[in-house]
Amino acid sequence: SGPVKELVGSVGGAVTFPLKSKVKQVDSIVWTFNTTPLVTIQPEGGTIIVTQNRNRERVDFPDGGYSLKLSKLKKNDSGIYYVGIYSSSLQQPSTQEYVLHVYEHLSKPKVTMGLQSNKNGTCVTNLTCCMEHGEEDVIYTWKALGQAANESHNGSILPISWRWGESDMTFICVARNPVSRNFSSPILARKLCEGAADDPDSSMV
């Protein structure tokens, strides 16, 4: 029995739970998901029983091996998977535990602008990046592209200080999770500061 294996999958995608055994006479292999039986295999008997019929089309065994491939992943497939290999040649079953995290492919992040001040020819505000559907485990970074130097900023909130007359800057939010990344629409400092003069608490996509 090895350490817990962490696996990552994306909604609609597939994941393979790796499993190898050097046991000659495997009587049965039992896979469970959050304590619910998922699949029972009897290699010598040639039978594979998928407990819930709706999972039959999602279960496969690549190259006829012991590893289990689960496809058409859904968010609620996230959880703990456990496999036991039972054999008369083993005093106790050989076991392995897996933790699966299923993530959605990220949609375009939304950017909102906080209160803005225009003092001494300098436009000061915050841009906040967020996912509309509250996706989990999202990491945000900002890219600030200008003529001088390109800068990166970690976190969902980007403080901006832009002086009128300086070369224009472009801000892009990058949202990442373990399976995908997506970009906000680019935001130009000049446009942002012009628009904000009229509407001090505005939002943009």
Partner: antibody
Framework: QMQLVQSGAEVKKTGSSVKVSCKAS????????MNWVRQAPGQALEWMGR????????KYNGKFKGRVTITRDRSMSTAYMELSSLRSEDTAMYYC?????????????WGQGTLVTVSS | EIVLTQSPATLSLSPGERATLSCKAS??????VAWYQQKPGLAPRLLIY???YRYTGIPDRFSGSGSGTDFTLTISRLEPEDFAVYYC??????????FGPGTKVDIK
Amino acid sequence: QMQLVQSGAEVKKTGSSVKVSCKASGYTFTSSWMNWVRQAPGQALEWMGRIYPGDGDTKYNGKFKGRVTITRDRSMSTAYMELSSLRSEDTAMYYCARSTMIATGAMDYWGQGTLVTVSS
Amino acid sequence: EIVLTQSPATLSLSPGERATLSCKASQDVSTAVAWYQQKPGLAPRLLIYSASYRYTGIPDRFSGSGSGTDFTLTISRLEPEDFAVYYCQQHYSTPPYTFGPGTKVDIK
């Protein structure tokens, strides 16, 4: 990649023996059952027996009444099938075939075949 | 010994048509049936094992079904390369494993 390469064609006399070899590569030879299957000209497939290369355990089709012996050489990753007391009806293509792990009676990789012709 | 019977012996169809091949076992073999494709001069190729599990790399136009004594291999839309002989095999419990006599799928 996974490959099973068999020895060349044989022409044998009635009453003699033939030994066919099957060299495995691209996978762990000792961890999968190796089967032998034959096919007479224009006929169906016939399972002869199998060996577990890890420990040499064998299982045979009773039809061959002790005429077939399957062995292996672990150091050479090679399996052998010997058929004795040959008769004309043993003229056939002989295949070695690896068992899948998940269903040990299903065979996923096959050798190219060895034609054995028995003549009087 | 478990005896497998395949029908029809020959199936004459055109490319694009659906092929349905039958295999009957003389006794209950649960879901332990495999299907193979064989072309002239070549070794058999595993298509399906445990009645309905497609082997890696096999196109999804091939599907298997059945349990107990009645099994079916379906080719949803025949491609030119699918014209061949198809064998069912029972791989239930202890050997000997047995094969059916085969169904030849040829071009109409």
